[in-house]
C-alpha cells in the first residue's frame, strides 16, 4: 500500500524555539515515522533537518538548527515505513516574520504602597531578537486579587514601579512584550502575585519638583514630619530600558546627601544634557522611608521651561489673569518659541479645595468667585508637543481679594 504524505504542517516559532506540527494522513497505518528536509533561498539541494528525522510523533523541534532568521526557508515532509510517501512541501517562510515573542520573565518586589516590576526577555541572549533587544516594550495587566478589576498599563520598560497601592494587599499581574517596530505583540507571562507589606512607619517624600535658579537646580519636595534628613539619587533614564540587566546604579547627588530641609540646591553642571530619574528618601535616624516616586528630569526642557509669570485683575465674582513670559535672573523675559498650555490652580485661602483651569490663551478668566474673599492662584506651563510632553514647576502662589459685589462690569 502506498504511504500518503502528511498534511497540514504548522510551523510555530516562539523566541528561539522552532516547533513543527503535522497531521498523519493515514491513522490506520502503524509504526510510521516522519522526516523533514529544508532548503535555503537560492539553493537547489535539500538538507536533512536535524531534530526532525525518523520522528514517531507528529511534532518535532528544530531549534538546534542555526538559521539566519531573516532568510527565507522551505520545508518538506514525508512519511516512512518500508517505503516512503511522496514529499509534501510547506510554504516557504522567513523565521523572523513568523516568530512570536514568548512570555517575558517577571520579578516582583513589594513595598507597602508600591510594587517594583523587573521584566526580562523570556529567552536570554535570543538569536531571534538579537537586533531588537533594546526595542522591546512591555504592557501589563494588574488587579487586586480580591476584586479582579483589571488595570492596563502600556508602554513600560524593563523596570517599572507601580505606586499608590494599598498596604497588606495581594496584587496579581501578567506581562507581555511587544516589538512595535515589527508589529509584533507577544504572549502573556504566567500570572505573578505579590502582597504589599504592612504600612511603613515613615511615608516617602512627595511632590518632587525641579526648578532653575541662576546656574543652579532647586529640588523641592513635601514631607509629613519635621526633623528628618533626606537623600536624593539619580539614574540615567535610558537604563530602565536595558533588557536583562537589573542592577540599577543609582547615584547620590553630593549636595543632596543628608540634607535637613525639604529642598536642596545643586549646580546645573552636575548633570550633562540628558534625561534622568530622581528619587528622594527620608530618614529619622532610626527608620528610613521607601523611596519616593521617581520623577523624570530632562535637562534640556528644565533649562527653558520656566513657570509662567502672571498678573491678576480682581473683580467681585472673578479674576482676570494675564500670563506673561517668565523672567530669567536679571529680569529679562524668556522667549519660549513653542506652543504652551497653561494650568491654573486656584483655591479659597481658608480652604484646601483646589479648582483647576487648563487654557491655551494667555488671558484667562477665573469665574464663580465670592465677593470680598481671598483666593490664591498658581500656574504652570506644559508643552503641547506630544514628543516633548514636559511641564514647568508651579509658580509661587499669588493671593488676592475679590472686590465687593456689583463690580463685575
Amino acid at each position: 500500500k502506498n504511504l500518503k504524505s502528511p498534511q497540514k504542517v504548522e510551523v510555530d516559532i516562539i523566541d528561539d524555539n522552532f516547533i513543527l506540527r503535522w497531521n498523519r494522513s493515514d491513522e490506520s497505518v502503524g509504526n510510521v515515522t516522519f522526516s523533514f528536509d529544508y532548503q535555503k533561498t537560492g539553493m537547489d539541494n535539500w538538507i536533512k533537518l536535524s531534530g526532525c528525522q525518523n520522528i514517531t510523533s507528529t511534532k518535532c523541534n528544530f531549534s538546534s538548527l542555526k538559521l539566519n532568521v531573516y532568510e527565507e526557508i522551505k520545508l518538506r515532509i514525508r512519511a516512512e515505513k518500508e517505503n516512503t510517501s511522496s514529499w509534501y512541501e510547506v510554504d516557504s517562510f522567513t523565521p523572523f516574520r513568523k516568530a512570536q515573542i514568548g512570555p517575558p520573565e517577571v520579578h516582583l518586589e513589594a513595598e507597602d504602597k508600591a510594587i517594583v516590576i523587573h521584566i526580562s526577555p523570556g529567552t536570554k541572549d535570543s538569536v531571534m531578537w538579537a537586533l531588537d533587544g533594546l526595542s522591546f516594550t512591555y504592557s501589563l495587566v494588574i488587579w487586586k486579587n480580591s476584586s479582579g478589576v483589571e488595570e492596563r498599563i502600556e508602554n513600560i520598560y524593563s523596570r517599572h514601579k507601580i505606586y499608590k497601592l494599598s498596604p497588606e494587599t495581594t496584587y496579581c499581574l501578567k506581562v507581555k512584550a511587544a516589538l512595535l517596530t515589527s508589529w509584533k505583540i507577544g504572549v502573556y507571562s504566567p500570572v505573578h502575585c505579590i502582597k504589599t507589606t504592612v504600612e511603613n512607619e515613615l511615608p516617602p517624600p512627595e511632590n518632587i519638583e525641579v526648578s532653575v535658579q541662576n546656574q543652579n537646580y532647586v529640588l523641592k519636595w513635601d514631607y509629613t514630619y519635621a526633623n528628618m534628613t533626606f537623600q536624593v539619587q539619580w539614574l540615567h533614564a535610558f537604563l530602565k530600558r536595558n533588557p536583562g540587566n537589573h542592577l540599577y546604579k543609582w547615584k547620590q547627588i553630593p549636595d543632596c546627601e543628608n540634607v535637613k530641609t525639604t529642598q536642596c540646591v545643586f549646580p546645573q553642571n552636575v548633570f550633562q544634557k540628558g534625561i534622568y530619574l530622581l528619587r528622594v528618601q527620608a530618614s529619622d535616624g532610626n527608620n528610613t522611608s521607601f523611596w519616593s516616586e521617581e520623577i523624570k528630569f530632562d535637562t534640556e526642557i528644565q533649562a527653558f521651561l520656566l513657570p509662567p509669570v502672571f498678573n491678576i485683575r480682581s473683580l467681585s465674582d472673578s479674576f482676570h489673569i494675564y500670563i506673561g513670559a517668565p523672567k530669567q535672573s536679571g529680569n529679562t523675559p524668556v522667549i519660549q518659541d513653542y506652543p504652551l498650555i497653561y494650568e491654573i490652580i486656584f483655591w479659597e485661602n481658608t480652604s484646601n479645595a483646589e479648582r483647576k483651569i487648563i487654557e491655551k490663551k494667555t488671558d484667562v478668566t477665573v469665574p464663580n468667585l465670592k465677593p470680598l474673599t481671598v483666593y490664591c492662584v498658581k500656574a504652570r506651563a506644559h508643552t503641547m508637543d506630544e514628543k516633548l510632553n514636559k511641564s514647568s514647576v508651579f509658580s509661587d502662589a499669588v493671593c488676592e481679594k475679590t472686590k465687593p459685589g456689583n463690580t463685575s462690569k
Partner: antibody, heavy 118, light 107 residues
Framework: EVQLQQSGAELVKPGASVKLSCTAS????????IHWVKQRTEQGLEWIGR????????KYAPKFQGKATITADTSSNTAYLHLSSLTSEDTAVYYC???????????WGQGTSLTVSS | DIVMTQSQKFMSTLVGDRVSVTCKAS??????VAWYQQKPGQSPKALIY???YRYSGVPDRFTGSGSGTDFTLTISNVQSEDLAEYFC?????????FGGGTKLEIK
C-alpha cells in the same frame, strides 16, 4: 564561568596596613558592584563597603569609615581593599563579592585570611 | 542601621525533615532580603534573593518567604549536605546588614 579570585593569606604587625585584592573572571567588573565583607572566627558577616568600578564611587558602613578604602582597576578587572592602622580586631577572613541583579551578592571569592599579630 | 535578628543561633534536625530558619528586620525592608548558606571552611553561597526567588542551581527544597519585617528560609526534606550556617541579609538601604547566622546541625 564567573569567578572571584582573592589574594593569599596575610600576617601583619599591629599599626601596619595591608591591601587585599580580588580579581574577577567571567564578567566585567564595570557592570557590577564589588562588595567587601568581614568575618571574624565563629562570628557573623559584616558588610564593609562597596565600589562601583565604572566610576570609582564608594560607600562604606559607618564602622569601617576611615579604616577601609576600596579601589578598583578596570584594566585588570580587579578590586582592592586597603585596611589601615591594623589591630587584633582586624584579624578575620575578608571576602569580596559581586553585587549583581537587584543588588544581591550573587558570587563570592574564596576569602583572604588576615592575621594581625606582633 | 537596619538590624537583622536571627533569634535561633543553632537548630537541630533529622535528614528528611523540614526546618524553618527565621529572620526579623528592625524596620520594614519590603522584600529586599537575601539568604546565604555557608558550609564549614567555605565562603558563603547565595540561595535566595528578593525574599522568595531561588538562584539557579539551588535545589527547590530551599524556599524563601516573608515581607516587611519577618522572613523565613524553609528547607524541606533536609539532606546531610545542608549542614551549614544560614545568614539573612537586607539590601533595602546602606548598609547591607546581615543577620547573626543560624547553624543547622544534622542529628
Amino acid at each position: 564561568e564567573v569567578q572571584l579570585q582573592q589574594s593569599g593569606a596575610e600576617l601583619v604587625k599591629p599599626g601596619a596596613s595591608v591591601k587585599l585584592s580580588c580579581t574577577a573572571s567571567g564578567f566585567n567588573i564595570k557592570d557590577y558592584y564589588i562588595h567587601w565583607v568581614k568575618q571574624r572566627t565563629e562570628q557573623g558577616l559584616e558588610w564593609i563597603g562597596r565600589i562601583d568600578p565604572e566610576d570609582g564611587e564608594t560607600k562604606y558602613a559607618p564602622k569601617f569609615q576611615g579604616k577601609a578604602t576600596i579601589t578598583a582597576d578596570t584594566s585588570s578587572n580587579t578590586a582592592y581593599l586597603h585596611l589601615s592602622s591594623l589591630t587584633s580586631e582586624d584579624t578575620a577572613v575578608y571576602y569580596c563579592s559581586r553585587g549583581g541583579n537587584f543588588y544581591y551578592f550573587d558570587y563570592w571569592g574564596q576569602g583572604t585570611s588576615l592575621t594581625v599579630s606582633s | 542601621d537596619i538590624v537583622m535578628t536571627q533569634s535561633q543561633k543553632f537548630m537541630s534536625t533529622l535528614v528528611g525533615d523540614r526546618v524553618s530558619v527565621t529572620c526579623k528586620a528592625s524596620q520594614n525592608v519590603g522584600t529586599n532580603v537575601a539568604w546565604y548558606q555557608q558550609k564549614p571552611g567555605q565562603s558563603p553561597k547565595a540561595l535566595i534573593y528578593s525574599a522568595s526567588y531561588r538562584y539557579s542551581g539551588v535545589p527547590d527544597r530551599f524556599t524563601g518567604s516573608g515581607s516587611g519585617t519577618d522572613f523565613t528560609l524553609t528547607i524541606s526534606n533536609v539532606q546531610s549536605e545542608d549542614l551549614a550556617e544560614y545568614f539573612c541579609q537586607q539590601c533595602n538601604s546602606y548598609s547591607y546588614t546581615f543577620g547573626g547566622g543560624t547553624k543547622l546541625e544534622i542529628k
